[in-house]
């Protein structure tokens, strides 16, 4: 009886099992009982990354500099191009189809995790004892100045946005 299922790396067509084309090659013609599957290598800037019966190769992804993208890894006949973002930007999606500028942490917030090409800046509110008085994509929350270690006293309490103000101790008469 004609086969109803085929082995791995084969496909069923016209009651016959034909070899799939290897990664990096596309299907030109199905096998017959007299000749094997005819495959051709993908062209420049094309790829196929699986054993396949595709009649067209996929185009490599274009890393559009106008969208803030650059090539992280050049594509081959078997792999797609991998894009990443230019310095100071990160991808807007898993597929990195566009980039946006890294977020800055507002005053009162510090950087918990610095942004990468694929993830945005993670900010955290400055806890008691810490402050940030700038909008920054790099600055962490800084600890308030310790007046005591300078033999000074707190003249103005710190906030999450301002440091304490130290001053001399009142002298006892």
């Amino acid at each position: 009886e004609p086969p109803t299922a085929c082995r791995e790396k084969q496909y069923l067509i016209n009651s016959q099992c034909c070899s799939l084309c290897q990664p990096g090659q596309k299907l030109v013609s199905d096998c017959t009982e007299f000749t094997e599957t005819e495959c051709l290598p993908c062209g420049e800037s094309e790829f196929l990354d699986t054993w396949n019966r595709e009649t067209h190769c996929h185009q490599h992804k274009y890393c559009d500099p106008n969208l803030g993208l650059r090539v992280q890894q050049k594509g081959t006949s078997e792999t797609d191009t991998i894009c990443t973002c230019k310095e100071g930007q990160h991808c807007t999606s898993k597929d990195c189809e566009a980039c946006v500028l890294h977020r800055s942490c507002s005053p009162g917030f510090g950087v918990k995790q610095i942004a990468t090409g694929v993830s945005d800046t993670i900010c955290e509110p400055c806890p008691v004892g810490f402050f940030s008085n700038v909008s920054s994509a790099f600055e962490k929350c800084h600890p308030w100045t310790s007046c005591e270690t300078k033999d000074l006293v707190v003249q103005q309490a710190g906030t999450n946005k301002t440091d304490v103000v130290c001053g001399p101790q009142d002298r006892l008469r």
């Epitope: 004609p2 016209n14 017959t32 009982e33 007299f34 000749t35 094997e36 005819e38």
Partner: antibody, heavy 117, light 107 residues
Framework: EVQLLESGGGLVQPGGSLRLSCAAS????????MSWVRQAPGKGLEWVSG????????YYADSVKGRFTISRDNSKNTLYLQMNSLRAEDTAVYYC??????????WGQGTLVTVSS | DIQMTQSPSSLSASVGDRVTITCRAS??????LNWYQQKPGKAPKLLIY???SLQSGVPSRFSGSGSGTDFTLTISSLQPEDFATYYC?????????FGQGTKLEIK
Amino acid sequence: EVQLLESGGGLVQPGGSLRLSCAASGFTFSSYAMSWVRQAPGKGLEWVSGIGSYGGGTYYADSVKGRFTISRDNSKNTLYLQMNSLRAEDTAVYYCARYVNFGMDYWGQGTLVTVSS
Amino acid sequence: DIQMTQSPSSLSASVGDRVTITCRASQSISSYLNWYQQKPGKAPKLLIYAASSLQSGVPSRFSGSGSGTDFTLTISSLQPEDFATYYCQQYGRNPPTFGQGTKLEIK
């Protein structure tokens, strides 16, 4: 024992017709692709035509396309080659062969076709 | 059609010799190549399929290798019954095509 026996060869004039037969025995004929291969006197082998198993597709060399027709009768375990518009360059020994995994593992003894006026 | 070119066209050798016949395809055919032996007045006989697999019943002194466009048939130690004509045949593209043959003669 697998056996393939060709018949139907002979002398024919240019433009004439001939029908070759290949009687198969010793195997399940319908399960195998079959082909015709020819060999001109003192020359090499030339694949002429093939027919798939289970009534599969038919395939031809460019040199015979439109003139030769391959067919099979699974109930009679017989392969045929209808040859029309014969030319002098079709003169050859014609072999039928059984196909398995893209190779011809059993061949007949051949039948001679001579096209001459 | 794919052209298959064998070399040499003829070859003289002695019993016990190691003999190599080459076959070149006009374009890549992966490992989709068979080798046949034909003796005068007889039908061809399949020796090697898929470039390097020995057909059942064929002596192990016969071996095949190669892929892409260049293939070889090797007989490790010639026996008297090996003097014949050898053909390569591709099945990577329709239609299947044969090489022109290599005639192996006794020296």
